[in-house]
Amino acid sequence: MKVLQEPTCVSDYMSISTCEWKMNGPTNCSTELRLLYQLVFLLSEAHTCIPENNGGAGCVCHLLMDDVVSADNYTLDLWAGQQLLWKGSFKPSEHVKPRAPGNLTVHTNVSDTLLLTWSNPYPPDNYLYNHLTYAVNIWSENDPADFRIYNVTYLEPSLRIAASTLKSGISYRARVRAWAQCYNTTWSEWSPSTKWHNSYREPFEQH
């Protein structure tokens, strides 16, 4: 049994880091493998993660952490029974993938303005809380070409757009994702999408 693709890990910079790797053949990850992880700290102890299958030869493990600070470094040991298959390390602050925003809501009752709001996925005491910026994706269910991205570079989790920038009388969907420049993170996953029917009063045509 050998590791074909070494584990790569990303952290949500809160409580979970996710490591993925591939074996050289079909593997029952949960019964055959264990990933041991330990914070490099005098008084820490090793924790065991039981991996799950992620495709035939792929494995994924969700490492639980109390919290994360920039100095944290973890040692990782991948075991198959008594055999050490791979040894490495992981610094969560250097591999951050933020949590996805939640509770995306489209408020259509403001006069001819669409207000999209969502929730910051971090509690106020987390460092990323004040460092997230967002991308909002809006697309038409009827027209695949009607697909747009709005970059929200301010901290407030909201976006206002004129309803008239979208076509009237058709349904749209929106979703939002986050990233943090400070840690050069990857983008989060997209939030679940939300759907609304876009309708607004056409202005009187002037002749």
């Epitope: 700290f41 005098l42 008084l43 820490s44 102890e45 109390d66 600070v69 920039s70 100095a71």
Partner: antibody, heavy 116, light 111 residues
Framework: EVQLLESGGGLVQPGGSLRLSCAAS????????MAWVRQAPGKGLEWVSA????????YYADSVKGRFTISRDNSKNTLYLQMNSLRAEDTAVYYC?????????WGQGTLVTVSS | QSVLTQPPSASGTPGQRVTISCSGS????????FNWYQQLPGTAPKLLIY???HRPSGVPDRFSGSKSGTSASLAISGLRSEDEADYYC???????????LGGGTKLTVLG
């Protein structure tokens, strides 16, 4: 609410023994390393000993090595410090502290006086 | 004598910014991060800063920490009378498997 309550302090003669206890509540005791820190009257803080969450690894300051023993009972949420061969210079307030990278919660301390 | 050196005293007037230094000796290992504790008169110490610059919840943002090599600093801005206390720096010494604490700095708020 995290609470640490030390007990067992008192007056003891040089060469004597004392056992301090620290009762923990308000958090999952078995998931945290713990430590003892002391403060002699009018002096600064001095780290004494620390123990990992399972008790697998234990560390002592040179000044108490061979005389003091730290231990824990996770089923009772209690930390202990067995102090033998006590000396006058061990006189101090002994604080129990929870460890999360640093000493993030402290008890109110118990006074140990070593005097003849 | 402590491996971490702090000035024995510091002072400032209300509203001022004061800084307390904590210096590791030249041979001190540059590995662990620094922590700061506040001890108000007659009370148990309290964690103020951990991992060089992180504040536990409930600690005002007037308190900030920084690290440079084997030295660290605690800054207190907008000084208040209730900040009058002893301040200690500490770090894990991985070379000797121990926790070391500075000698403490007594902060006096004047006026």
């Amino acid at each position: 609410e995290v609470q640490l309550l030390e007990s067992g302090g008192g007056l003891v003669q040089p060469g004597g023994s004392l056992r301090l206890s620290c009762a923990a509540s308000g958090f999952t005791f078995s998931r945290h390393a713990m430590a003892w820190v002391r403060q002699a009257p009018g002096k600064g803080l001095e780290w004494v000993s620390a123990i990992t969450m399972s008790g697998r690894s234990i560390y002592y300051a040179d000044s108490v090595k061979g005389r003091f023993t730290i231990s824990r009972d996770n089923s009772k949420n209690t930390l202990y410090l067995q102090m033998n061969s006590l000396r006058a210079e061990d006189t101090a307030v002994y604080y129990c502290a929870r460890v999360h990278r640093a000493f993030d919660y402290w008890g109110q301390g118990t006074l140990v006086t070593v005097s003849s | 004598q402590s491996v971490l050196t702090q000035p024995p005293s510091a002072s400032g007037t209300p509203g001022q910014r004061v800084t307390i230094s904590c210096s590791g000796s030249p041979l001190f290992p540059d590995s662990g991060s620094f922590n700061w504790y506040q001890q108000l008169p007659g009370t148990a110490p309290k964690l103020l800063i951990y991992a060089d610059s992180h504040r536990p919840s409930g600690v005002p943002d007037r308190f900030s920490g920084s690290k440079s090599g084997t030295s660290a600093s605690l800054a207190i801005s907008g000084l208040r009378s209730e900040d009058e206390a002893d301040y200690y720096c500490g770090t894990w010494d991985y070379s000797l498997n121990r926790y070391v604490l500075g000698g403490g700095t007594k902060l006096t708020v004047l006026g």
